[in-house]
Interface confidence: medium
C-alpha cells in the first residue's frame, strides 16, 4: 500500500502538522498591550489545527520546532504618523507558563506601518504565545493585512 | 524497510511536497497591476514542483494548507523615491477562480524599498494566484531582490 | 503499528528534517562584511539538527531545498540614523565552494532599522551560507531581534 | 540586431518646440523601458526623462520635468521626446537608450543620437 | 541626487598596460546598482559593466569591475589599442539616473 494512502488513513495529529492562523480580534483594555486573536473556517482563512486559543493568545499542544510567523499593519498609518508616534513595537514571547516566559521575536516599525517576520523556535506543549503591540497606534482587522500564524516543523 | 527508504520510491508529488519559488519575469501592460512571474532550473534558482505556471501566474495543483512567501524590491528606489510615490502597494491574492477571489496578503511599501512577508493560508486545486503591484514604481528582477513562492504545509 | 509510533523509532535525520536557527554571536573584523553566527541549547533557544557551524558560518549537510529565513535589527539605530548611513544592507548567499557562489537573498534597511525576509532555495551538502551586511552601522545581538536560520523542506 | 535609430533633431530658437522619435527594431519594444540621454558638447551625459514598456510610468529629470514629455506607440516601434519651451542649456545630442528589461536598470543599447541646437 | 566623481579625469598609457578607473558616489549606490560605459568621438555609449562587476555579452575578460557603497573601479587588465576612450559610470538605483564625466584614457 502506498505511504501516501496510508497517510490519508491516520489521523493528522498523528504526523504532528500542527498549524495555526489567526486573524486578530481586538486588541486589549488599556494597560493590557496584548493583541487578542481568532481562527476558524466561520471567520474566513484562519484555522486551528492542534493549537488551540486561549483566551485569545495560541496555546501549544504539541512539543517540537515550530515555525513562527506574524504580519502587523498599522490600522491609520502613514510614514509620518508612524515616526511620529515612534516607537511602536511589536514582540511575540512565550507568556506562560511563567517558568519560560521569554520574548522570540521582536520589531519596532520606525517610519513604516507595517512589520513581517518570522523565526523558528522550539516550544513545547503548554506554551501560549502572546503578541505585544506597545505604543499609541492600533493594528489595522484586515484580514490580509494582520495575522500570526505558527506551523510545526519537526519533534 | 525504512520509512526513509520508502519515501524513496515514492514519488514526491505523492508525499503532498508541491513546492514553487519564482523569479520575476515583467510586469503587465498598462492597467494590468499584475507582476508576472517564471520558473524553472534553465532561469536559475527557480522551480516548480507540483504547481505551475498560467501565463506568468500560480496555479495549485494540489488542495492543502500552504506557507505562501514573497519579497518585492523596487527597482529605482531610495526612501525619498518611494515616499513620492507613495502609495505603492503589493498584494497577493486568489485571482481564478472568480468565486473564490480574494486578498491573501497585503503590504504598502511607505519610505522603504523592499516588503517581505509570509502567511500560512488555505489553497485548493486550481486556485490562481496574482501578485498586484499598484503605483508608479516597478521591481527589480534581480533574482536576490525579487521572488515569490509556496510550499504545501498539509492537507 | 501506527505511522507516528514508526516515525519515532527512525532517527529524523533519515527523514531528511535538517532544520538550524542561530544567533548572532559576532561581526567580522574590519573588511570582512561577513556576520558570525553561532547556535545550540546552552545558548537559549538556537539550535542546529544536521547542518553545521564552520567558522561562524552555517554549511548544509543534506542536498535538498531550504527554507531560509532572516531578520537583521541594527543595533543603534532610529530611522534617522538609518538613513544617514544609508545603504546598510543584508545578503545572504552561497559563499563555498566557489564554484556555487551566488546571492540568495537581499535588501535594504533604508529609513528602517530591522530587515527580515525568507525564501525557498535549492541547497546542496556542503554549501556553506554567508550573510554579509555592509555598511557603518552595527547588528543587535539580542536573539529575539536578530537570527538566522534553515529549514529542510523536500528533496 | 538591435537598433535605435533617432530622428528630428536640428535647429530651432529659444522657447520654440521639437519633437524626437526612435524607431526601434531587433527587439520585442513593449516589453522593455526606454529613456532618452543627452550629452551637451564637452559635457557628461544626463538621464533626461524614462518611460515603461507600457507607457504606462513616464520619470524626468528635474531640469526638463513639466517641458518635456516621453510617450510611446508600441505598435509603431517607436518612442518620442516632445520638447517645449527650449532653452539654450538644452543643446546637446539626444540618445534613445534601450533599459536592459522592463523595470529600468542599466542602459544596454543606445542610438546614434540626433543634435538639438537651441540658439537665437 | 548621487552625483558621481569619476578620476583621473585623464589618464595617459600604453598599449599592454594596465588601466584602474575609479568612480566615487557621493552617496551609496544601491545594492551595486552601478554601470561602466565606453565611448568612442561621434560614437554612442557602449555597454562594459553592469551590477558594479558583471560583464555585458560580448565584452572582453580583459574589463573588469569591483566596488560597492561609494568607491567602484574599472580595471583594464592589458590595454589594446581600441581600449582608448572615454569611460563614464552611472548609477540606476534612484531616480533621477545620474553619470559620472568620464575618465579619458589616451594612448602615451
Known amino acids: 500500500q502506498r505511504f501516501a494512502q496510508a497517510q490519508q488513513q491516520l489521523p493528522l495529529e498523528s504526523l504532528g502538522w500542527d498549524v495555526a492562523e489567526l486573524q486578530l480580534n481586538h486588541t486589549g483594555p488599556q494597560q493590557d498591550p496584548r493583541l487578542y486573536w481568532q481562527g476558524g473556517p466561520a471567520l474566513g482563512r484562519s484555522f486551528l489545527h492542534g493549537p488551540e486559543l486561549d483566551k485569545g493568545q495560541l496555546r501549544i499542544h504539541r512539543d517540537g520546532i515550530y515555525m513562527v510567523h506574524i504580519q502587523v499593519t498599522l490600522a491609520i498609518c502613514s510614514s509620518t504618523t508612524a515616526s511620529r508616534h515612534h516607537p511602536t513595537t511589536l514582540a511575540v514571547g512565550i507568556c506562560s507558563p511563567a517558568s519560560r516566559s521569554i520574548s522570540l521575536l521582536r520589531l519596532s516599525f520606525h517610519q513604516g506601518c507595517t512589520i513581517a517576520s518570522q523565526r523558528l523556535t522550539p516550544l513545547a506543549r503548554g506554551d501560549t504565545l502572546c503578541t505585544n503591540l506597545t505604543g499609541t497606534l492600533l493594528p489595522s482587522r484586515n484580514t490580509d493585512e494582520t495575522f500570526f500564524g505558527v506551523q510545526w516543523v519537526r519533534p | 524497510q525504512r520509512f526513509a527508504q520508502a519515501q524513496q520510491q515514492l514519488p514526491l508529488e505523492s508525499l503532498g511536497w508541491d513546492v514553487a519559488e519564482l523569479q520575476l519575469n515583467h510586469t503587465g501592460p498598462q492597467q494590468d497591476p499584475r507582476l508576472y512571474w517564471q520558473g524553472g532550473p534553465a532561469l536559475g534558482r527557480s522551480f516548480l514542483h507540483g504547481p505551475e505556471l498560467d501565463k506568468g501566474q500560480l496555479r495549485i495543483h494540489r488542495d492543502g494548507i500552504y506557507m505562501v512567501h514573497i519579497q518585492v524590491t523596487l527597482a529605482i528606489c531610495s526612501s525619498t523615491t518611494a515616499s513620492r510615490h507613495h502609495p505603492t502597494t503589493l498584494a497577493v491574492g486568489i485571482c481564478s477562480p472568480a468565486s473564490r477571489s480574494i486578498s491573501l496578503l497585503r503590504l504598502s511599501f511607505h519610505q522603504g524599498c523592499t516588503i517581505a512577508s509570509q502567511r500560512l493560508t488555505p489553497l485548493a486545486r486550481g486556485d490562481t494566484l496574482c501578485t498586484n503591484l499598484t503605483g508608479t514604481l516597478l521591481p527589480s528582477r534581480n533574482t536576490d531582490e525579487t521572488f515569490f513562492g509556496v510550499q504545501w504545509v498539509r492537507p | 503499528q501506527r505511522f507516528a509510533q514508526a516515525q519515532q523509532q527512525l532517527p529524523l535525520e533519515s527523514l531528511g528534517w535538517d532544520v538550524a536557527e542561530l544567533q548572532l554571536n559576532h561581526t567580522g573584523p574590519q573588511q570582512d562584511p561577513r556576520l558570525y553566527w553561532q547556535g545550540g541549547p546552552a545558548l537559549g533557544r538556537s539550535f542546529l539538527h544536521g547542518p553545521e557551524l564552520d567558522k561562524g558560518q552555517l554549511r548544509i549537510h543534506r542536498d535538498g531545498i531550504y527554507m531560509v529565513h532572516i531578520q537583521v535589527t541594527l543595533a543603534i539605530c532610529s530611522s534617522t540614523t538609518a538613513s544617514r548611513h544609508h545603504p546598510t544592507t543584508l545578503a545572504v548567499g552561497i559563499c563555498s565552494p566557489a564554484s556555487r557562489s551566488i546571492s540568495l537573498l537581499r535588501l535594504s534597511f533604508h529609513q528602517g532599522c530591522t530587515i527580515a525576509s525568507q525564501r525557498l532555495t535549492p541547497l546542496a551538502r556542503g554549501d556553506t551560507l554567508c550573510t554579509n551586511l555592509t555598511g557603518t552601522l552595527l547588528p543587535s545581538r539580542n536573539t529575539d531581534e536578530t537570527f538566522f536560520g534553515v529549514q529542510w523542506v523536500r528533496p | 540586431e538591435v537598433q535605435l535609430l533617432e530622428s528630428g533633431g536640428g535647429m530651432v530658437q529659444p522657447g520654440g518646440s521639437l519633437r524626437l522619435s526612435c524607431a526601434a527594431s531587433?527587439?520585442?519594444?513593449?516589453?522593455?523601458?526606454m529613456s532618452w540621454v543627452r550629452q551637451a558638447p564637452g559635457k557628461c551625459l544626463e538621464w533626461v526623462s524614462a518611460?515603461?514598456?507600457?507607457?504606462?510610468?513616464?520619470f524626468y529629470a528635474e531640469s526638463v520635468e513639466g517641458r518635456f514629455t516621453i510617450s510611446r506607440d508600441n505598435s509603431k516601434n517607436t518612442l518620442y521626446l516632445q520638447m517645449n519651451s527650449l532653452r539654450a542649456e538644452d543643446t546637446a545630442v539626444y540618445y534613445c537608450?534601450?533599459?536592459?528589461?522592463?523595470?529600468?536598470?542599466?542602459?544596454?543599447?543606445w542610438g546614434q543620437g540626433t543634435l538639438v541646437t537651441v540658439s537665437s | 541626487e548621487i552625483v558621481l566623481t569619476q578620476s583621473p579625469g585623464t589618464l595617459s598609457l600604453s598599449p599592454g598596460e594596465r588601466a584602474t578607473l575609479s568612480c566615487r558616489a557621493s552617496q551609496s549606490v544601491r545594492s551595486t546598482y552601478l554601470a561602466w560605459y565606453q565611448q568612442k568621438p561621434g560614437q554612442a555609449p557602449r555597454l562594459l559593466i553592469y551590477?558594479?562587476?558583471s560583464r555585458a555579452t560580448g565584452i572582453p575578460d580583459r574589463f573588469s569591475g569591483s566596488g560597492s557603497g561609494t568607491d567602484f573601479t574599472l580595471t583594464i587588465s592589458r590595454l589594446e589599442p581600441e581600449d582608448f576612450a572615454v569611460y563614464s559610470c552611472q548609477q540606476y538605483g534612484d531616480l533621477p539616473f545620474t553619470f559620472g564625466c568620464g575618465t579619458k584614457l589616451e594612448i602615451k
Open positions: 518611460i515603461s514598456g507600457s507607457g504606462g510610468r513616464t
Open positions: 551590477g558594479a562587476s
Open positions: 531587433g527587439f520585442t519594444f513593449s516589453t522593455y523601458a
Open positions: 537608450a534601450k533599459h536592459d528589461y522592463s523595470n529600468y536598470p542599466y542602459f544596454d543599447y
